[in-house]
């Protein structure tokens, strides 16, 4: 039997996606304009390079990182690109409406594109938990809900807790992880008999996933420093992130070998653990004054990541139906929490050192921010999961989970599987 895209989705997806795109174009037409004030073209180029780094991270890094499934690599990469493209457009509008709209028009700057790319990155982290079990129409819903939830979370945190751009965006790790896990929890879990092989990794896709990990590894310092205000903060963030990811690579590879009875290195462990330091150091990367602390963080993060990759997949597979190789969700949830805890610890050390009596209040604020991020992630994730379960989206049948042929035309394959 030929494996065609379900007829109902053929009607639904183009109509849904193109209508949405037309709506976005109209919103851009009526409500946005470019920042016309740029005087310094050299500054423009330098500023664009940061945005370019973020786009490379999103499109190539996260796109390929999620492409390790034997029969779902094409979809992983292309669907990621689709979500990124859609997510950036909606995030620019949403951020503008939330922060600038009283003034009448949304001014688009390179900074707003930077913010939007980072918001869209949240979806690409979350989607790792559900890729292969949903179609593009469902992913469109996920993009819209998650970007909206993250945008509102950032605005609420900014207004209530008075955090700066960097701090309220660094909740992205925890937010994206818990959002993705809660969506996955809502989707049909058991893989039917005979499809287990599809969620296994294969050598070529695993190599492309490693390529994705390498791109993320190279550009993570740009991500952690993108929203910082002053050169000294950005310098600290770049250095500390670099040291942290460097140590987490060494820890990941050696820890993976240590965790295996025969001392062999697991591809899956390495894919995620190389990024561990970058996630863990994210929240406090600009505050750490010396390399050794960032390196210790990278070491701890690498160990946690390898430990998590060894012991958590079984639990995640049973409870959430997440395949063994989709470990970004629980990895980022653990490491994001570690990063937030490190920030709180630094806060405690600082307030104790200063002796200004504000320790309890500052810690309470930070815990409040973190709790709010997790609650909104879980609530919006559950809402998204429930929406994705609606019949109108014509979700792939469980027998066709993790299968490129459901979505792609392969001319060399005369018949389906």
């Amino acid at each position: 039997m030929s494996s065609k895209y379900p007829r109902s989705v053929r009607r639904c997806l183009p109509l849904w996606a193109l209508t949405l795109e037309a709506a976005l174009i109209l919103l851009f037409y009526f409500f946005t304009h470019y920042d016309a004030s740029l005087e310094d073209q050299k500054g423009l180029v330098a500023s664009y390079q940061v945005g370019q780094d973020l786009t490379v991270m999103a499109a190539i890094g996260l796109g390929f990182l999620t492409s390790s499934f034997r029969r779902h690599s094409w979809s992983s990469v292309a669907f990621n690109l689709f979500m990124l493209a859609l997510g950036v457009q909606w995030a620019i509008l949403l951020d503008g409406f939330l922060s600038q709209f009283p003034s009448g028009k949304v001014v688009i700057t390179l900074f707003s594109i930077r913010l939007a790319t980072m918001s869209a990155l949240s979806v690409l982290i979350s989607v790792d938990a559900v890729l292969g079990k949903v179609n593009l129409a469902q992913l469109v819903v996920m993009v819209l809900v998650e970007v909206t939830a993250l945008g509102n979370l950032r605005m609420v945190i900014s207004n209530i807790f008075n955090t700066d751009y960097h701090m309220n965006m660094m909740h992205i790790y925890v937010f994206a992880a818990y959002f993705g896990l809660s969506v996955a929890w809502c989707l049909p879990k058991p893989l039917p008999e005979g499809t287990e092989d599809k969620d296994q990794t294969a050598t070529i896709p695993s190599l492309s996933a490693m390529l994705g990990a390498l791109f993320l590894w190279m550009f993570w310092p740009s991500f952690n420093s993108a929203l910082l205000r002053s050169p000294i903060e950005r310098k600290n963030a770049v250095f500390n992130t670099y040291y942290a990811v460097a140590v987490s690579v060494v820890t990941a590879i050696s820890g993976s070998s240590l965790a295996h009875p025969q001392g062999k290195i697991s591809k899956t462990y390495v894919h995620s653990a190389v990024l561990a330091g970058g996630v863990a150091v994210g929240t406090s990367c600009h505050l750490i004054p010396s390399p050794w602390l960032a390196m210790v963080l990278g070491l701890v993060a690498g160990l946690i990541s390898v430990g998590g990759a060894k012991y958590l997949p079984g639990c995640c597979n049973r409870v959430l139906g997440i395949p063994h190789s989709s470990i970004m969700g629980y990895n980022f949830s653990l490491l994001g929490l570690l990063g937030e805890i490190i920030y709180i610890v630094l806060l405690v050390l600082d307030t104790v050192g200063a002796g200004n009596g504000m320790i309890g209040f500052q810690v309470l604020l930070s815990i409040g921010e973190l709790s709010l991020a997790i609650v909104i992630a879980l609530m919006s994730g559950l809402l998204t999961g429930l929406l994705l379960n609606l019949k109108i989206w014509k979700a792939p049948h469980e027998a066709k989970y993790f299968d490129d042929q459901v979505f792609w035309k392969f001319p060399h394959l005369a018949v389906g599987f």
Epitope: V50, D164, P231, A354
Partner: antibody, heavy 126, light 108 residues
Framework: QVQLVESGGGVVQPGRSLRLSCAAS????????MHWVRQAPGKGLEWVAV????????DYADSVKGRFTISRDNSKNTLYLQMNSVRAEDTAVYYC???????????????????WGQGTTVTVSS | DIQMTQSPSSLSASVGDRVTITCRAS??????LNWYQQKPGKAPKLLIY???TLQSGVPSRFSGSGSGTHFTLTISSLQREDFATYYC??????????FGQGTKVEIK
């Protein structure tokens, strides 16, 4: 020595436009965020806008959002404030100021305006 | 937005007096508070940042204290050149910064 010199002030009619400039010297201009702060006659200081060191981000007070635009040219060591659709309440002395970021211990950075220009007067009158 | 309230709005003092100016924030700002001095017809000048750190070149008779919502600027022994208007300013609620309404210190 470190110096900021504003220019471009004057009398302008309501609804019209004006562009203020601030020339910086004696420090590496491209390494510092810059602010505009104004002071209406007989009143206190009011923060207007900030631009980050690389020009990547700009933030404005609600009272000027959508009307004023802050920009900089790091190659010319100059900060600008483009004032459109000016109102009577925009009458003030406009100061440019340099932003210094400092950190103690592991705390969040402190931002402070450590160097100020002498100011330029803008009068909105018909 | 965070509101800053200074008290008193003006005070009269003599040379040699100890003067204290208070600044209150509408919500906790930790130690993200700066003090400025402005003389008539002149630009403001930074005195103290991070609530208690003296800016270089500022005489040691100026000191700042406080955290959270309550801050004070103290001039231990008022000098003739200290007669001016003093402003507090918060940098916690970035991106928007707010100043207090000012305290004018006059000669008695």
């Amino acid at each position: 020595q470190v110096q900021l010199v504003e220019s471009g002030g004057g009398v302008v009619q309501p609804g019209r436009s004006l562009r203020l400039s601030c020339a910086a010297s004696g420090f590496t201009f491209s390494s510092y965020g810059m602010h505009w702060v104004r002071q209406a006659p007989g009143k206190g200081l009011e923060w207007v806008a900030v631009i980050w060191y690389d020009g990547s981000n700009k933030d404005y007070a609600d009272s000027v959002k959508g009307r004023f635009t802050i920009s900089r040219d790091n190659s010319k060591n100059t900060l600008y404030l483009q004032m459109n659709s000016v109102r009577a309440e925009d009458t003030a002395v406009y100061y440019c100021a340099r932003e210094l970021s400092t950190q103690r211990g592991y705390s969040r950075y402190h931002y402070v305006m450590d160097v100020w220009g002498q100011g330029t007067t803008v009068t909105v009158s018909s | 937005d965070i509101q800053m309230t200074q008290s008193p709005s003006s005070l009269s003092a003599s040379v040699g007096d100890r003067v204290t100016i208070t600044c209150r924030a509408s919500q906790s700002i930790s130690t993200y508070l700066n003090w400025y001095q402005q003389k008539p017809g002149k630009a403001p000048k930074l005195l103290i940042y991070a609530a208690s750190t003296l800016q270089s070149g500022v005489p040691s008779r100026f000191s700042g204290s406080g955290s959270g919502t309550h801050f004070t600027l103290t001039i231990s022994s008022l000098q003739r050149e200290d007669f001016a208007t003093y402003y507090c300013q918060q940098s916690y609620g970035t991106p928007t910064w707010t100043f207090g309404q000012g305290t004018k210190v006059e000669i008695k």
